[in-house]
């Protein structure tokens, strides 16, 4: 069997809402993945599990099941959404995210995703981790790759 390549492209959109009284931030983050099947047979993308971390704390998890089948030598782009909550110990971020005097309220989030594929009864897992900028102050749609956070912590490809 040849490889199945999973490429995390980036954040596609982030929709934000707030709980004023509980000083809580709700971020619905939609991410984009490219999955390439380099084989001469079809593979099934069985599930995608994702989680988002802020400041080493998991703030959101998502799981998609029975997603798609990728044909031989084909590539599919898949979007998945992770609902996240920044609250309680992190409610200090509410002030930053709702501060009117600044235009962009970027926070750094670590996106983790694991893709499980199957073919001929064989299962394979591929994981990716990326640090991304997300604006927690307004609804934002990103150009693919625009939210990339480039620093020494960025895992190597």
């Amino acid at each position: 069997p040849r490889s199945i390549d999973v490429k995390y492209i980036g954040v596609k959109s982030a929709y934000v809402s707030y709980d004023v009284q509980k000083r809580t931030i709700y971020l619905n983050i939609t991410n984009t993945l490219n999955i390439t099947n380099n084989n001469y047979y079809s593979v099934e993308v069985e599930n995608i599990t994702a989680q988002v971390q802020f400041s080493k704390t998991v703030i959101g998890k998502a799981r998609l099941n029975n997603i798609t089948i990728i044909g031989p030598l084909d590539m599919k782009q898949i979007d998945y959404t992770v609902p996240t909550v920044i609250a309680e110990e992190m409610s200090y971020m509410y002030d930053f995210c709702t501060l009117i005097s600044i235009k962009v309220h970027n926070i750094v989030l670590m996106m983790q995703v694991t893709v499980t594929t199957t073919y001929f009864g064989h299962s394979e897992q591929i994981s990716q981790e990326r640090y991304q900028y997300v604006d927690c102050g307004r609804n934002t749609t990103y150009q693919l790759g625009q939210s990339e956070y480039l620093n020494v912590l960025q895992p190597q490809q």
Partner: antibody, heavy 121, light 112 residues
Framework: QVQLQQSGAELAKPGASVKLSCKAS????????MHWVKQRPGQGLEWIGY????????KNNQKFKDKVTLTADKSSSTAYMQLSSLTYEDSAVYYC??????????????WGTGTTVTVSS | DIVMTQAAPSVPVTPGESVSISCRSS???????????SYWFLQRPGQSPQLLIY???NLASGVPDRFSGSGSGTAFTLRISRVEAEDVGVYYC?????????FGGGTKLEIK
């Protein structure tokens, strides 16, 4: 129906500690934050703090930071407030109150029966 | 901390008449989402407080429509039309916007 049943009156000496309880019934305990409010005899209401029964997270009024410990037991649907190093100023009625509602629209919709704490030597 | 002030410690009223109880906050309780986070509670003698009005003007469940709330960002009014004997007690305003939540000192409604 939704009820908050608080423990009975407490008589304690200065320097001692007391633990008050607030047993919730008629709703899902972990779905709503529980707040505590103090009322000294013949006086107004003072917000002490809250506990989120789901996570155990608490937030206290700074004024009560070293005085109060808030906890919750999911298995018995009971919230607790411990008052330590009691002084005469701690003599009051203490209420628990459920914070009902929904996002950005919360309010104290159900109040407990109140527990009277008397500090006397 | 936001200070809630109820200037009148007590208000006398004749049954069947209307009465207004006022409250002021040291900071605006009007949020940019359009909601005003002021609340009114009634504490009848020997009882626990009960919610009357939430978000300045919304009537709580089970409260008679004789009660109504109004105001601006910093000035709030609770109006009781056709006062009944059961309305006696202490009325408290509260801000539910910023920690620590704070209450007014209370206004006692007394029947003449």
């Amino acid at each position: 129906q939704v009820q908050l049943q608080q423990s009975g009156a407490e008589l304690a000496k200065p320097g001692a500690s007391v633990k008050l309880s607030c047993k919730a019934s008629g709703y899902t305990f972990t779905s709503y934050w529980m707040h505590w409010v103090k009322q000294r005899p013949g006086q107004g209401l003072e917000w002490i703090g809250y506990v989120n029964p789901s996570s155990g997270y608490t937030k206290n009024n700074q004024k009560f930071k070293d005085k109060v410990t808030l906890t919750a037991d999911k298995s018995s649907s009971t919230a607790y407030m411990q008052l330590s190093s009691l002084t005469y100023e701690d003599s009051a009625v203490y209420y628990c109150a459920r914070e009902g509602g929904s996002i950005s629209d919360w309010y104290f919709d159900v109040w407990g029966t109140g527990t009277t704490v008397t500090v006397s030597s | 901390d936001i200070v809630m002030t109820q200037a009148a410690p007590s208000v006398p009223v004749t049954p069947g008449e209307s009465v207004s109880i006022s409250c002021r906050s040291s900071k605006s309780l009007l949020h940019s989402n359009g909601n005003t986070y002021s609340y009114w509670f009634l504490q009848r003698p020997g009882q626990s407080p009960q919610l009357l009005i939430y978000r300045m003007s919304n009537l709580a469940s089970g409260v008679p429509d004789r009660f109504s709330g109004s105001g601006s960002g910093t000035a709030f009014t609770l109006r009781i039309s056709r006062v009944e004997a059961e309305d006696v007690g202490v009325y408290y305003c509260m801000q539910h916007l910023e920690y620590p939540y704070t209450f007014g000192g209370g206004t006692k409604l007394e029947i003449k």
